[in-house]
Interface confidence: low
């Protein structure tokens, strides 16, 4: 790498007399007036605006106690204005000033881009006293410069509450291009235009950008950074990167994959978690999303029964969670279940179908022809009924539940009896005389208790009376 020193401003040494060390000396004044030498007048005029006092970066000392002699204006000596160097090199630069010995406690501080440099910087100040003045040289060194060291450096010195500021020294650290924006991976719709952005900076500038697609350059002529590549559309996956070039060489961005959005793969591993008489809880593992988020899923349910019409029930659900409770199913039925999910491109194929069964349901009809008789001699109530016409889906009949409610003045008592499935009659003891007994019967399967029959009432008289009440739910066709 090459280290250059370019003098942006012509050096103007300020003070008469030689300075120690290797510093260049010159008797030219601040304004480079050829006829002057020695001390400068206390009042100077700006070369850019004649007639106005010029006091920038110059401290005008007061008259000495002798009152006979003007002190020179104080200013930092001009030095190299611009240092260009490569990354990781070392650099050292300084500013110098000659200060009359009448001033005590002069300190020089270094500033970069308007902020004071404090702490762990390599700043050294050396003093070279003479009879009337002290030459002060403040050196600043940076080991292995980084891009972050780029900037404008100045020295400041305070004297008599006046602030003297040096001319800036611009440090420019050059290196390979540095990416400030790299292309990003994207999932795009097939054959649809999209943009990729690449930005890199020096110094040195300019930085030129080449685009690369699948290892081949896209643009024959480079574009100045920043560069936006408009891709008119892709039909298959591609990898893009950008090359940034400057005078120091080439930097290549990360390669980014541009995927083509596609139809999702079908879900896998459809599982049954819970079955009831009328619902099945399923879950599934989503397939590959086709580089586009799933929007929703469809659960397809077919009844597996030679007598069914083969129609498919479709239940739409959100894509997440990957679980769905299928409802409104028949009891004790076999179903084939598949899941399909969609993204913005379209629907996946259906998952492998799985078989699932609902459990037994409760009966859907009540026992028929319920009749109730009072058997006074035995002091009990005789109840008879006909077995309900239950559907296969209700499962196997396991018995009957009989509810009998006894009501008389001031009391009401409900009792429940369970009888086996082979029964079609039952006897219950009279609980209360001079009361009404209301009887209802329900069929019971493993799936639960079915609906109760319509109530049948019978009046139980005081001892010695006889009454009986048949009827309630007649069998179909027996009105």
């Amino acid at each position: 790498a090459i280290t250059e020193a370019r003098e942006e401003a012509k050096p103007y040494p300020l003070f008469p007399g030689p300075l120690p060390g290797s510093l260049q000396t010159d008797h030219t004044s601040l304004l480079s007036l050829p006829h002057t030498s020695g001390y400068q007048p206390a009042l100077m005029f700006s070369p850019t605006q004649p007639g106005r006092p010029y006091t920038g970066n110059v401290a005008i000392p007061r008259v000495t106690s002798a009152g006979s002699k003007l002190l020179p204006p104080l200013a930092f000596k001009h030095t190299v204005g611009h240092i260009i160097l490569s990354e990781h090199k070392d650099v050292k630069f300084n500013c110098s000033i000659s200060v009359p010995n009448i001033y005590q406690d002069t300190t020089i501080s270094w500033w970069k881009d308007g902020k004071e440099l404090l702490g762990a910087h390599h700043a050294i100040t050396q003093f070279y006293p003479d009879d009337e003045v002290t030459a002060i040289i403040a050196s600043f060194s940076i080991t292995s410069v980084q891009r972050s060291d780029n900037g404008s450096y100045i020295c400041k010195m305070k004297i008599n509450n006046e602030e003297i500021v040096s001319d800036p020294i611009y440090i420019e650290v050059q290196g390979l291009p540095h990416f400030t924006k790299q292309p990003e991976s994207m999932n795009v719709t097939r054959n649809t235009a999209f943009n990729l952005t690449c930005q890199a900076v020096g110094p040195p500038e300019p930085v030129n950008i080449f685009w690369v697609q699948n290892s081949s350059r896209v643009n024959e002529q480079p574009e100045k950074s920043p560069s936006v590549l408009t891709v008119p559309g892709l039909t298959e996956m591609a990898v893009f990167s950008c090359e940034a070039h400057n005078d120091k060489g080439l930097t290549v961005s990360k390669g980014v994959q541009i995927n083509i959005k596609a139809i999702p793969s079908p879900p896998t591993e459809v599982s049954i978690h819970n079955s009831t008489a009328h619902s099945i809880l399923i879950s599934w593992v989503p397939g590959f999303d086709g580089y586009s988020p799933f929007r929703n899923c469809s659960v397809q349910v077919k009844e597996v029964d030679p007598l069914s019409n083969g129609s498919v029930m479709i239940f739409n659900t959100s894509a997440s969670p990957h679980m769905y409770q299928i409802k409104q199913l028949q009891a004790l039925a076999n179903y084939s279940i598949g899941v399909s999910c969609m993204n913005e491109i379209g629907w996946s194929a259906v998952s492998p179908w799985i078989l699932a069964s609902t459990t037994e349901g409760a009966p859907s009809v009540a026992p028929l022809n319920v009749t109730v008789f009072l058997n006074e001699s035995r002091d009990n109530v005789d109840i008879r009924w006909m077995k309900p016409l239950t559907k296969r889906q209700a499962g196997e009949l396991v018995g009957y539940r009989i509810s009998h409610v006894w009501q008389s003045a001031g009391i009401s008592k409900e009792l429940l009896e369970e009888v086996g499935q082979n029964n079609s009659r039952a006897q219950i003891s009279v609980q209360v005389h001079n009361a009404t007994c209301t009887v209802r019967i329900a069929a019971v399967t493993k799936g639960g208790v079915g609906p109760f029959s319509d109530p049948v009432k019978i009046f139980i008289p005081a001892h010695g009376w006889v009454d009986h009440a048949p009827s309630s739910t007649p069998a179909p066709g027996n009105a």
């Epitope: 097939r190 054959n191 298959e236 083509i260 596609a262 139809i263 580089y291 491109i345 379209g346 629907w347």
Partner: antibody, heavy 120, light 108 residues
Framework: QVQLQQSGPELVKPGASVKLSCKAS????????INWVKQRPGQGLEWIGW????????KYKEKFKGKATLTVDTSSSTAYMELHSLTSEDSAVYFC?????????????WGQGTTLTVSS | EIVLTQSPTTMATSPGEKITITCSAS???????LHWYQQKPGFSPKLLIY???NLASGVPDRFSGSGSGTSYSLTIGTMEAEDVATYYC?????????FGAGTKLELK
């Protein structure tokens, strides 16, 4: 279920053109490519090209550019392949096949094939 | 273009035999891009295995596939009479899409 139904056999004279059809059903026609594949008698399979029904984008094998033109009619979910300037070399069975492209292109469903005979 | 070379070209087999067909690619392709088809005489090809080792719907599990890079194979664990067909490999990595020349399985 997915089905690709191709048009019947064709007997045409050299120099003429012919248009074969492939009617798709059982899926969203615009979401998958339709590919065309050539098989000469007793030979292997040769990919001709594809068309993406959603926007009509086509991709051809170099040797079939100018020989084959792929089109679609989305309203009837039908893909077409027109073959031009026919010679005996074009006598073959032509299959349409649905392409599952998701960056790993394969043909998941095929038509039954159309036999083309070019003879004077 | 990527050239796929299948071997053997023809193979006479007996039911019960284990059969292996190989497919060699002229340049390396990811296993995601290699697929196999079965074509029975007088019928259209049928997807058999996709992405090197995934069985297509309805394909018996006596079929299996493996491989990576440039070398792939299709295996029939136990040959059955209904497996008499020509088998083709296909790559989906680059355009043009290409097939192997096919391997014809016959019964002895």
């Amino acid at each position: 279920q997915v089905q690709l139904q191709q048009s019947g056999p064709e007997l045409v004279k050299p120099g003429a053109s012919v248009k074969l059809s492939c009617k798709a059903s059982g899926y969203t026609f615009t979401s998958y490519d339709i590919n065309w594949v050539k098989q000469r008698p007793g030979q292997g399979l040769e990919w001709i090209g594809w068309i993406y029904p959603r926007d009509g984008y086509t991709k051809y094998k170099e040797k079939f550019k100018g020989k084959a033109t792929l089109t679609v009619d989305t309203s009837s979910s039908t893909a077409y392949m027109e073959l031009h300037s026919l010679t005996s070399e074009d006598s073959a069975v032509y299959f349409c096949a649905r392409g599952f492209y998701s960056n790993l292109y394969y043909f998941d469903y095929w038509g039954q094939g159309t036999t083309l005979t070019v003879s004077s | 273009e990527i050239v796929l070379t299948q071997s053997p070209t023809t193979m006479a087999t007996s039911p019960g035999e284990k059969i292996t067909i190989t497919c060699s690619a002229s340049s390396s392709i990811s296993s995601n891009y290699l697929h196999w088809y079965q074509q029975k005489p007088g019928f259209s090809p049928k997807l058999l295995i996709y992405r090197t080792s995934n069985l297509a719907s309805g394909v018996p599990d006596r079929f299996s596939g493996s491989g990576s890079g440039t070398s792939y194979s299709l295996t029939i664990g136990t040959m059955e009479a209904e497996d008499v067909a020509t088998y083709y490999c296909q790559q989906g990595r680059s355009i043009p899409l290409t097939f192997g020349a096919g391997t014809k399985l016959e019964l002895k």
